[in-house]
């Protein structure tokens, strides 16, 4: 498994409810990464042990986080996996999604896709302290 976590994790709000997360492959000996796992949740959900699990297949080191809710601070962690197993998670990165000044976001139709705000509880191969510890 990759010895280290993805590095250079950055999260940028690119639309009122969508963020771009980008990163670089783990440092160290050349390792072919086959999948990245992104864990993200609002700070409140994260502390409660509830987060969303997004797998980014393939080599492109970017992902879109969809259906974010204004007024929340989101916490993001990423790990890299290969055919041997999953490596450690990166330090957490925070993104504040500020409330909109207008109610425009309330007028939009519900997004009928995989971003239908489900959250999943679990330890995901990590203990509770590592999941809720904010770096």
């Amino acid at each position: 498994a990759p010895a280290g976590p993805p590095v250079g994790v950055k999260v940028t709000l690119i639309e009122d409810d969508t963020a771009l997360v980008s990163w670089k492959p783990p440092d160290g000996p050349e390792t072919v990464v086959t999948r990245y796992t992104i864990l993200y949740a609002s700070r409140k959900a994260w502390i409660a042990g509830e987060w969303q699990v997004l797998h980014r297949e393939g080599a492109i080191t970017m992902a879109l986080l969809e259906n974010l809710v204004a007024g929340n601070v989101y916490i993001v962690k990423i790990s890299a996996s290969n055919e041997v197993g999953e490596g450690p998670f990166s330090n957490s990165v925070e993104l504040a999604v500020l409330p909109k000044e207008t109610s425009e976001s309330n007028q939009r139709p519900k997004r009928l896709d995989s971003a239908d705000a489900k959250v999943y509880s679990g330890y995901y191969h990590l203990d509770q302290k590592s999941m809720t510890g904010i770096a």
């Epitope: 699990v53 997004l54 139709p109 009928l112 896709d113 995989s114």
Partner: nanobody, 119 residues
Framework: EVQLVESGGGLVQPGGSLRLSCKGS????????MHWVRQAPGKALEWIGY???????KYNPSLKSLVTISRDNSKNTLYLQMNSLRAEDTATYYC?????????????WGQGTLVTVSS
Amino acid sequence: EVQLVESGGGLVQPGGSLRLSCKGSGFNFGDYAMHWVRQAPGKALEWIGYIYNTGSTKYNPSLKSLVTISRDNSKNTLYLQMNSLRAEDTATYYCVSTVTNGVEYFQHWGQGTLVTVSS
């Protein structure tokens, strides 16, 4: 296996138009929203917009007047129509889909198609 394959890129003159396609396979294409994003050489990724499975769209305000996103679910194909192209529209264009198995989400990006705007 989920696959997204973009096509239609190439060299186009300033002021010209281009239509990109993205063919999806390995998932229920008609069930999911689809995004277009682009990355100019040496620049950050820029979100263009997305289209719901119902066909309604949302665009990056700075690009809204220049692009139109559409889809044909019967052909499992996503489209991006670009008009009045400028040199700064030179970029690699990607389509993106996030698919769920009901428990986890799996995000897939196409390999990208390069659009070069130059005279």
